[in-house]
Amino acid sequence: HTDLSGKVFVFPRESVTDHVNLITPLEKPLQNFTLCFRAYSDLSRAYSLFSYNTQGRDNELLVYKERVGEYSLYIGRHKVTSKVIEKFPAPVHICVSWESSSGIAEFWINGTPLVKKGLRQGYFVEAQPKIVLGQEQDSYGGKFDRSQSFVGEIGDLYMWDSVLPPENILSAYQGTPLPANILDWQALNYEIRGYVIIKPLVWV
């Protein structure tokens, strides 16, 4: 694994090929999670930020930007969207959490919580995922669509199997995250596919 502290994945072009596979040995279904990362893009169209598919299950967990100021979370093919007033283009720190028992999903944008939404109460997110940055999967690890591809930079990505309390979300935003047990930017197992470059993080 690699400590990517102070670095980002740069996706320099629109494509149907360029992506990063994130590798985790996640063995049991997720009842809760929190995902945080930083992103910087000047795309005004829709694009995928984090695509998590399992065998035979598309959009099992997907973080998707619909347009400026609109973020969507898919859980088991169901979707909620939260809105925020944001500058464009501008760097953003995104956290999203979901809790199976209540179905509550919550986005935090730059350390500020958005309106909570609910979906898939009682559902468990399947384990053994293929996780892709840069493209939106329509199959297990593939079937990409250029029009949903990400162009820009992503870094500081962490994923926990719990709903983090607000103070820990703010710690992540401020650059001092808790140790993460699903994906950890400081100990990341990944595979670069296509034209993706690792560069220093210069926009925080």
């Epitope: 694994h1 690699t2 400590d3 990517l4 502290s5 102070g6 985790t24 040995p25 926990w160 199997d161 719990s162 808790l178 140790p179 047990n181 400081q186 100990a187 197992n189």
Partner: antibody, heavy 119, light 107 residues
Framework: QVQLVQSGAEVKKPGSSVKVSCKAS????????MHWVRQAPGQGLEWIGM????????NYNEKFKSRATLTVDKSTSTAYMELSSLRSEDTAVYYC????????????WGQGTLVTVSS | DIQMTQSPSSLSASVGDRVTITCKAS??????VAWYQQKPGKAPKALIY???YRYSGVPSRFSGSGSGTDFTLTISSLQPEDFATYYC?????????FGQGTKLEIK
């Protein structure tokens, strides 16, 4: 096989410093966080801090932040832990331990280095 | 810092006994707990990670459970080589902290 071999026992005077080494073999040294843990005689385990050999990023237990320094020598696959301003309560066995590939636990440990602080 | 409180601190048992050691965290640590075994004069060895997963090569008589604040390590049928000291460790927050240990002795 994966191994961490530590330097030998040390006897130090109060106020002095000690530098313990931990030589890694059998795996890619620069790919795994190295942690340091100590154990006072007859006591439990206490986490000192961790270092990533490739980025040289560190994270310390606040208790040791002002006195402990973690470093690495990539050319020899060796990690070091230096503790300054030693006092009698620093008498302990100091262990290096490798973080697992995916999870935050320690899957490989050094054999330990006894540091005795005595006037 | 998160306190990890183990109980009992020592325990006498016989070969073949079923033994349970508990560890209580002072705040929620989710499932981010590991268990280690240590024998006198030796370094600790990993037994369990993520509260319930056995480290490779660890016999199936060792099992872990729990989440949140309460965790247990169970040895289903004690073997002579299991007499040692056991430590829990939380890796949910920095600094990582350990329990004070449970010494398992032969009755």
């Amino acid at each position: 096989q994966v191994q961490l071999v530590q330097s030998g026992a040390e006897v130090k005077k109060p106020g002095s410093s000690v530098k313990v080494s931990c030589k890694a073999s059998g795996y890619t040294f620069t790919s795994y966080w190295m942690h340091w843990v100590r154990q006072a005689p007859g006591q439990g385990l206490e986490w000192i801090g961790m270092i990533h050999p490739n980025s040289v990023n560190t994270n310390y237990n606040e208790k040791f932040k002002s006195r402990a320094t973690l470093t690495v020598d990539k050319s020899t696959s060796t990690a070091y832990m230096e503790l300054s301003s030693l006092r009698s309560e620093d008498t302990a066995v100091y262990y290096c331990a490798r973080r697992n590939d995916y999870y935050w636990y320690f899957d490989v440990w050094g054999q330990g280095t006894l540091v005795t602080v005595s006037s | 810092d998160i306190q990890m409180t183990q109980s009992p601190s020592s325990l006498s048992a016989s070969v073949g006994d079923r033994v349970t050691i508990t560890c209580k965290a002072s705040q929620n640590v989710n499932s981010n707990v590991a268990w280690y075994q240590q024998k006198p004069g030796k370094a600790p060895k990993a037994l369990i990670y993520s509260a319930s997963y056995r480290y490779s090569g660890v016999p199936s008589r060792f099992s872990g459970s729990g989440s949140g604040t309460d965790f247990t390590l169970t040895i289903s049928s004690l073997q002579p080589e299991d007499f040692a000291t056991y430590y829990c460790q939380q890796c949910n927050n920095y600094p990582f902290t350990f329990g004070q240990g449970t010494k398992l002795e032969i009755k």
